[in-house]
């Protein structure tokens, strides 16, 4: 691996001083170091109009090394270039500059998107969401007895979230109101409301629903028989038929 | 579009010379360090010289040192590979390449073949 | 010299199957690694530089890893095209030193 040639002639150099400091295996008054200690990289700066030469452990900021046989040597990244493997390739962008297959550019390609943590042109990531769950049974309150109206929920996961320039995540629930043939709760499934009621001697035919968290404002408090109820249900269903034809569900969405 | 083109390849007898010659284009050729690297029929990668960017140095593979010598023409974009005493072993596709920690540009490989 | 191990010398894939390939080094060269591909009847292409870095024109099915001793090129999904010799090579000082080589091939 010896070189053919041997470095330039010092004779260039009448002051060259073998009494050098920082590393310089060899330097003059003009140029500073010519040469360096064994293991030290070699970088020319430019001062002004001069260059001088300085040694070092590595090789500085826009700089890359080169360890050849008889000299490890720094040579300078292109100028918009902070870190670079050589001169074609660079691995990290200067402030501004967004760094897409080894080369520095200010603004990213088509079909890429600025990663403002990396200063990297990437892909666009779009989200990604499974199918839907199976609808849930059919609740009010938490309970799944003792109402004819309640609500239906399903939901999906989010297999990929998108990045700042993918589309938007849907949503990863959806409600809809559910009609079911009513039963009564059992005496353990009863729950405070029940017990309320019976505290307060209402109607013993009353069968009125607990009221739902989506869509009343609390405890229906009017008293009606029977037969007012069943009529009062009819006209409901009427009308949520009706509205189910416009609109298929109400959906209550999550977005992630 | 970057075009490194070797000429000068062929049959030689052993002990005889031949100086290969590669034509760049493409990059500015003065700014690199080129190398020779070449492939025997069937086998690997091997490095063979660098000259550095200005002609001022050289280095060379242990098999090929006091035989061959590597030259350059910054004025022709040319890279020279001067190959001497040949030996049978030397037969090779001999590429010429920019050579910058890697080889990122490659000629096509011109062949030489040592017999008798 | 530095001395490079690579592993498989050859190794025969399946359209669509995941391939790697391992290059062991025998010192320690940071990231000062690269790989290349080179087809039958072509001069070898640079295809990843810096250990990881995907060279312009390469496909993200390719990727490489590693640094300081252990290095390795994998390809995701093996295509019609990438039936070819693959060799690693350490940019770490001089002389610069190949890896043997690995002969990918189509089953």
């Known amino acids: 691996q010896n070189a053919s040639r041997g470095r330039r002639q010092r004779r260039m150099h009448p002051n060259v001083s073998q009494g050098c400091q920082g590393g310089c295996a060899t330097c003059s008054d003009y140029n500073g170091c010519l040469s360096c200690k064994p293991r030290l990289f070699f970088v020319l700066e430019r001062i002004g109009m001069k260059q001088i030469g300085v040694c070092l452990s590595s090789c500085p900021s826009g700089y890359y090394g080169t360890r050849y046989p008889d000299i490890n040597k720094c040579t300078k990244c292109k100028v918009d270039c902070d870190t670079c493997f050589n001169k074609n390739f660079c691995t990290k962008c200067k402030s501004g500059f967004y760094l897409h297959l080894g080369k520095c550019l200010d603004s990213c390609p088509e079909g890429l998107e600025a990663n403002n943590h990396t200063m990297e042109c990437v892909s666009i990531v779009h989200c990604e969401a499974s199918e839907w769950s199976p609808w849930s049974p059919c609740m009010k309150k938490g309970k799944t007895c003792g109402f004819k109206r309640g609500t239906e929920t399903r939901v999906r996961d989010i297999l990929q979230h998108p990045s700042a320039k993918g589309n938007l995540c849907p949503p990863t629930s959806e409600t809809r109101t559910c009609i079911v043939q009513r039963k009564k709760c059992s005496k353990g499934e009863r729950g405070k409301k029940g017990r309320e009621r019976k505290r307060k001697k209402l109607n013993k035919e009353e069968r009125k629903e607990t009221s739902s968290s989506s869509d009343s404002k609390g405890l229906e408090s009017s008293i009606e028989t029977p037969d007012q109820q069943e009529n009062k249900e009819r006209q409901q269903q009427q009308k949520r038929r009706a509205r189910d034809k416009q609109q298929k569900s109400v959906s209550v969405s999550t977005v992630h | 579009e970057v075009q490194l083109v070797e000429s000068g390849g062929g049959l030689v007898q052993p002990g005889r010379s031949l100086k290969l010659s590669c034509a760049a284009s493409?990059?500015?050729?003065?700014?690199?360090?080129m190398a020779w690297v070449r492939q025997a029929p069937k086998k690997g990668l091997e490095w063979v010289a660098t000259?550095?960017?200005?002609?001022?140095?050289?280095y060379f593979g242990d098999s090929v040192r006091g035989r061959f010598t590597v030259s350059r023409d910054n004025t022709k974009s040319t890279l020279y590979l001067q190959m001497d005493s040949l030996r049978s072993e030397d037969t090779a596709t001999y590429y010429c390449?920019?050579?910058?920690?890697?080889?990122?540009?490659w000629g096509q490989g011109v062949m030489v073949t040592v017999s008798s | 010299d530095i001395q490079m191990t690579q592993s498989p010398a050859s190794l025969s894939a399946s359209l669509g199957e995941t391939v790697s390939i391992e290059c062991l080094v025998s010192?320690?060269?940071?990231?000062?690694f690269v790989w290349y591909q080179q087809k039958s009847g072509k001069s070898p292409q640079l295809l990843i530089y810096?250990?990881?870095r995907l060279q312009d024109g390469v496909p993200s099915r390719f990727s490489g890893s590693g640094s300081g001793t252990r290095f390795s090129l994998r390809i995701s999904g093996m295509q019609p095209e990438d039936e070819a010799e693959y060799f690693c090579?350490?940019?770490?000082?001089?002389?610069?030193?190949f890896g043997a080589g690995t002969k990918l091939e189509l089953k």
């Open positions: 390449t920019a050579h910058d920690r890697s080889f990122d540009y």
């Open positions: 010192e320690d060269i940071s990231n000062d």
């Open positions: 810096a250990a990881s």
């Open positions: 000259i550095i960017y200005d002609g001022s140095r050289a």
């Open positions: 493409g990059f500015t050729f003065s700014d690199y360090d």
């Open positions: 090579q350490q940019s770490y000082k001089y002389p610069p030193t």
